[in-house]
């Protein structure tokens, strides 16, 4: 008889999860030779150890510490790019601007990007049927705790001028409940981070408003200033042109505003 399995509200573990994590680790070390010291089998074992056989609503940041230790990486000062609700453009940007890094450009973020996973208490099985949903089931689930852990670490290690890309099309351009708003903002270290520069990405072609004056941006500025970090904000009116100008800065049309 099939054993009873807890039914959660979220989708189950991504198919081929172990194979995907191991393959991504191998790919990452291939194209980032500075990470060749990383043993991918050990990385998978540490990843697995964080959630296998554990009740998936009782995962802690401590569970992920062995993995975090194995995936230790540093970003040069002034090269950290945070993002909120605008992942694709942030990744398109770092694909072109190769010396800047989002969390998903780092080993641990790359391993887990777009994946879902969870186990079950007291069994070595991975649950491919369902996993806890953050809202409907619990916040201390394997995926949410992972991203909270690695996001905290990513923010803690940032230095110099930190950039953040924000989605100007959303009702809350800065959302206190996002990972950026609830974790990263509060873990930037004032003794290492001189400034946070927000890039507000406009959605509409004809949108010429100064979204840096948005109340939620003012709220972000207040939080950051209280932490003794300077705050700057820029409107990116034309994201397509912005990317094109990052690719070809000499283009004559790039001398005007974007």
């Amino acid at each position: 008889l099939p054993r009873w399995r807890q039914q959660w509200s979220g989708s189950g573990t991504t198919s081929r999860f172990p194979e995907t994590v191991l393959a991504r680790c191998v790919k990452y070390t291939e194209v980032h030779p500075e990470m060749r010291h990383v043993d991918c089998q050990s990385v998978w074992d540490a990843f697995k150890g964080a959630f296998i056989s554990k009740y998936p609503c009782n995962i802690t940041e401590e569970d992920y510490q062995p993995l975090v230790k194995l995936g230790t990486q540093t970003v040069p000062c002034n090269k950290t790019l945070l993002w909120s609700r605008i992942k694709d453009l942030a990744h398109q940007f770092t694909q072109v601007q190769r010396d800047m890094f989002t969390l998903e450009d780092m080993l641990l973020g790359y391993l887990a990007d777009d994946l879902t996973w969870c186990g079950e208490f007291n069994t070595f099985e991975i649950n491919y049927q369902s996993c806890p949903d953050w809202r409907k089931d619990c916040s201390n689930n394997p995926v949410s705790v992972f991203w909270k852990t690695v996001s905290r670490r990513f923010a803690e290690t940032a230095c110099g001028v930190v950039h953040v890309m924000l989605n100007g099309s959303r009702s809350k351009i800065f959302d206190k409940n996002s990972t950026f708003g609830s974790v990263e903002v509060h873990n930037l270290q004032p003794e290492k981070v001189q400034a946070l520069e927000a890039w507000v990405i406009h959605g509409g072609r004809e949108d010429s408003r100064d979204l840096c004056q948005d109340p939620t941006i003012k709220e972000l500025e207040s939080i950051i200033s209280k932490r003794n970090i300077r705050f700057f904000c820029k409107n990116i009116y034309r994201p397509d042109k912005f990317l094109q100008c990052v690719k070809n800065p000499e283009d004559s049309s790039c001398l005007s505003g974007i």
């Epitope: 194979e19 393959a23 790919k27 194209v31 030779p33 991918c40 990744h91």
Partner: antibody, heavy 120, light 107 residues
Framework: EVQLVQSGAEVKKPGATVKISCKVS????????MNWVQQAPGKGLEWMGW????????DVAEKFQGRVTITADTSTDTAYMELSSLRSEDTAVYYC?????????????WGQGTTVTVSS | DIQMTQSPSSLSASVGDRVTITCKAS??????VDWYQQKPGKAPKLLIY???NDYTGVPSRFSGSGSGTDFTFTISSLQPEDIATYYC?????????FGGGTKVEIK
Amino acid sequence: EVQLVQSGAEVKKPGATVKISCKVSGYTFTDSVMNWVQQAPGKGLEWMGWIDPEYGRTDVAEKFQGRVTITADTSTDTAYMELSSLRSEDTAVYYCARTKYNSGYGFPYWGQGTTVTVSS
Amino acid sequence: DIQMTQSPSSLSASVGDRVTITCKASQNVDSDVDWYQQKPGKAPKLLIYKASNDYTGVPSRFSGSGSGTDFTFTISSLQPEDIATYYCMQSNTHPRTFGGGTKVEIK
């Protein structure tokens, strides 16, 4: 069995563009980076660039930047290498190649090669 | 870019002879050097990876050694089927770079 099968030979005029394909089988396409290597007649091997098919992220050697575009189609398990503004010195055999887990970072798997001739 | 200087560019030896090819990297590449055999009209074939590891199915007469900047590839007893061009490649840093090749012929 891992296989990398490349498209057939091409003859192109200077200034034209060539697009070579590399269709894979025997493994999950998105699980490995695909590399491209050039070999001009009587010359050695030159690494051109790579693509991570899962994300479409690429890196191209400086010598080929601006002329080489590497893409991947995960629906057909096929990688592509496009070389534009062709000149006579681009006459070469082009290979796709990939690594194997636990065999360092060399290339145990290669396509059979695609000959590109650039001639007016 | 890291230069891989391979020597000799060609050699002629008798069947049963010991053949040695060297590769010198312009900077430290640890042990990230691979050796390939290429026969006319064919794709290269991986023989040795990470300086000294035999790839699966490769005859034991092929071996490699070295680390840092100096690497050696050896055929302990040359066979007629070993007529080919041999290349070293460093896989330590992007871009990967190859040596100029050594053409091996039978006397």
